[in-house]
Interface confidence: medium
């Protein structure tokens, strides 16, 4: 399908102008490449009327142009001076008339209506409110006032100043006549439907003295605004319907083949399954605007949506509607990255998060997506640091790789964690997207130690336990603070090729702490990851606490060097705001062996990659 | 509409203190990272401090020890301490709320005039 895209459907009447927006994914060549608007023939072909390289045809001559807005990916063709004869099926297209790359426009140039002399013309869309201005002579004053509807040669009684209104106009319109010396009254239709359209005449007073008016009321379905955005993008439907309308159910639908709209999301808590985890209403503001944002775009999800307001929370005839006319674009600028990541209970995940490679130095965020009401994302972390604290020691949101992705880790994985997280920037809003995390069975690939008390003063040793398959991934561990996760120092240990035969005894990464100081309290990750690719982490608390009297201390090696498929997943955990953390004060006191003898080297904290029958409590 | 009203703003010689208030309407002042920027005369617009929903602050190096922010989220209120005031912190403060990239708000604008 053709990535190409513009109005369907164009009307307009003699003697006015048009201004017809084509789209176009704004690639270098795209941008650069010849636009043209062409007019279809009986043969098939299409005649260029109007190019981006300067040429009008006769027919446009002084009357039309075309221009290109390559920032934008747009182009807009003018004409002016329409003519009956303008009606007929055209093209926006780029590069070669014949290619392929453009959009069918439908232009159609009606005869404007034959209306009597002096008569008003009112233009309102559908649902707003008209106020017809009356006027009347003196001697009208005290008599009858009256609003009719002509259909046909025939004059239908709308509403009069004796209180007669008639039922297709029930609760939505009123006559107002003014204080004495004012000679005009007025009448107010509320809610317009689009069978209102047509011609009324006022009357005041009655025989060949009584005073008349013309009106006619044109009522128009809003015009769709043209939405343009990538697949896998974000869209936002910023929708103001007015104040008479502020405290009403709101709504976005889309309408359907049947011309009806589905209800995609309303104030009243419904939503469409097929946006779950991608999509919000945004709160309205005290005028009763608000706004939609829908992520993850799709090409199923093109169409045209309406937006208005209705107690039912859902489209009815006469209340105010806004339109948009949505296209994905499916050469999209937003790579793919997996929409949906699966973790393990007591595991981790890496999401990958694209944005606008343009903005490297945006503000980066992850939130959770939560359904109740119209939707909510609190944020759980931003690029300068986490935001909730019940995400303590678990959660960290890293700028690697860069040029266009960033990365989220969330370990200590339980089920409550499963849900839709949106990926944002404060930059580029059309590069928002969603990544649903989903809980399967299985076990973590990396194991450390439930929690360990260390020492002050003491060296500390974790092992961190990996199966064969990460054997040619990098390992690291770092220390878990609210900015981010600072790498430790590793050591070489043995030739480099310490994991190519991945036999049992060649599976841990272990970190040493020599001396444990006060500062070495907290959360140490051990992870695996190549390049700038982050894999599966493990975290483990780390207390310290003063050395006790000589003989009162425990050590327990076997929790310390845990066989490589042990399971040595922690169990206190704690609810708080509905998700499942770790909390290092609920832990069974446990400790890791410690090695009070000094550390050869000198560097306090290493990263140990060796052997578990080599594993020792000091570094070699 | 959405508002964002700064208050607080005035003359102060070199070595004071000021404190500049922001009030925000509560749906947008619950959900976002709400911070403060400045524009010194004949500058670009940057970055001071920021407090994110959770209570994260961040602060510009130049002003890191010296100014303060805090928010108080039952009157919807963001607060800007600034002490130990320099001629180079001259500039009009804006208010900022972000709402995670949803929305971006911004005040009119607060003039802090740092001179002796």
């Known amino acids: 399908k053709s990535p190409v895209f513009g109005p369907q459907e164009v009307s307009s009447v003699e003697g006015n102008s048009v201004s017809i927006k084509c789209y176009y994914p704004p690639t270098s060549v795209n941008r650069h490449t010849r636009k043209y608007w062409c007019r279809k023939g009986a043969s098939g072909r299409c005649i260029t009327l109007v190019s981006s390289e300067g040429y009008v045809s006769s027919n446009y001559a002084g009357r039309a142009n075309l221009t290109n807005f390559p920032e934008n990916g747009t182009f807009v063709v003018n004409i002016a001076q329409l003519s009956r004869d303008d009606s007929g099926h055209y093209k926006c297209g780029l590069g070669i008339n014949s290619r392929g790359l453009s959009f069918d426009v439908s232009l159609e140039v009606s005869q404007g209506p034959e209306l009597p002399n002096g008569t008003e013309v009112y233009t309102v869309d559908v649902g707003r409110t008209v106020t017809i201005k009356c006027p009347f002579k003196t001697e009208n004053a005290p008599k009858t006032k009256a609003l009719y509807k002509k259909i046909g040669q025939t004059s239908v009684l709308v509403i009069d100043s004796r209180n007669y209104v008639n039922p297709n106009y029930k609760d939505r319109i009123r006559l107002r006549i003014p204080g004495t010396g004012q000679l005009i009254f007025t009448v107010v239709i509320d809610r317009l439907r689009l069978s209102d359209h047509g011609l009324y005449l006022c009357q005041a007073g009655d025989g060949s003295n009584r005073d008349e008016k013309n009106a006619d009321l044109q009522v128009l379905e809003p015009e769709p605004e043209l939405v343009y955005e990538d697949l896998r993008g974000s869209v936002t439907f910023h929708c103001a319907l007015g104040l008479e309308v502020a405290n009403v159910a709101k709504f976005l639908c889309r309408v359907n083949s049947r011309e009806t709209c589905d209800v995609v999301i309303n104030t009243l808590g419904k939503r469409d399954s097929a946006f779950e985890g991608r999509i919000l209403l945004n709160p309205q503001d005290k005028d009763g605007s608000f706004s939609v944002v829908i992520t993850g775009l799709r090409k199923e999800d093109e169409g045209r949506y309406l937006c208005g307001a209705h107690s039912d929370g859902q489209l009815q005839e006469g209340w105010p509607i806004q339109a948009w006319q949505l296209f994905v674009n499916e050469e999209s600028t937003i790579p793919r990255s997996p929409t949906v990541v699966k973790g393990v209970a007591g595991g981790s995940v890496a999401v990958l998060c694209p944005y606008n490679p343009k903005e490297s130095q945006s503000l980066k965020y992850w939130c959770l997506w939560e359904g109740a009401q119209n939707g909510r994302c609190p944020l759980l972390v931003e690029s300068q640091g986490l935001v909730q604290e019940q995400y303590e020691g678990r959660l960290s949101l890293l700028q690697e790789p860069g040029n266009g992705t960033f990365t989220v880790i969330l370990n200590q994985l339980t089920t409550q964690d499963a849900g839709f997280y949106w990926c944002l920037t404060n930059g580029d809003t059309r590069w928002r997207t969603t990544v649903e995390i989903k809980i399967i069975e299985g076990e973590p690939n990396l194991k450390v130690p439930g929690n360990v008390t260390a020492v002050l003063g003491e060296t500390l040793n974790i092992p961190c336990h990996f199966p064969c398959k990460f054997s040619s991934y990098e390992k690291y561990w770092c220390k878990w603070s609210n900015t981010g996760c600072q790498t430790l120092p590793s050591q070489d240990e043995g030739p480099s090729e310490a994991f190519v035969n991945c036999d049992e005894n060649s599976r841990l990464v272990s970190l040493t702490l020599n001396p444990v100081t006060r500062a070495d309290e907290g959360w140490y990750w051990c992870g695996v990851k190549q390049g700038h690719f982050y894999g599966e982490t493990a975290a483990v608390y780390v207390a310290v606490e003063e050395k006790k009297v000589a003989g009162s201390r425990y050590v327990s090696p076997a929790k310390a060097d845990a066989a490589p498929d042990e399971k040595v997943l922690d169990s206190g955990v704690r609810e708080i705001e509905n998700k499942a953390i770790q909390d290092p004060r609920l832990f069974a006191e446990e400790k890791v062996v410690a090695d009070t003898g000094d550390q050869a080297g000198g560097s306090r904290a290493s990263v140990d990659s060796s052997s578990s029958e080599e594993q020792g409590g000091s570094s070699k | 509409q959405v508002q964002l009203v700064e208050s607080g703003g005035g003359l102060v010689q070199p070595g004071g203190s000021l404190r500049l208030s922001c009030a925000a309407s509560g749906s947008i002042f619950s959900a976002s990272v709400m911070g403060w920027y400045r524009q010194g005369p004949g500058k670009q617009r940057e970055f001071v401090a920021r407090?994110?929903?959770?209570?994260?602050?961040h602060y510009a190096d130049s002003v890191k020890g010296r100014f303060t922010i805090s928010k108080d989220n039952a009157k919807n209120t963001v607060t800007l301490q600034m002490n130990s005031l320099k001629p180079e912190d001259t500039a009009v403060y804006y208010c900022?709320?972000?709402?995670?990239?949803?929305?971006?708000?911004w005040g009119q604008g607060t003039l802090v005039t740092v001179s002796s």
């Open positions: 407090i994110s929903p959770g209570g994260v602050t």
């Open positions: 900022n709320a972000d709402r995670f990239g949803f929305e971006v708000y």
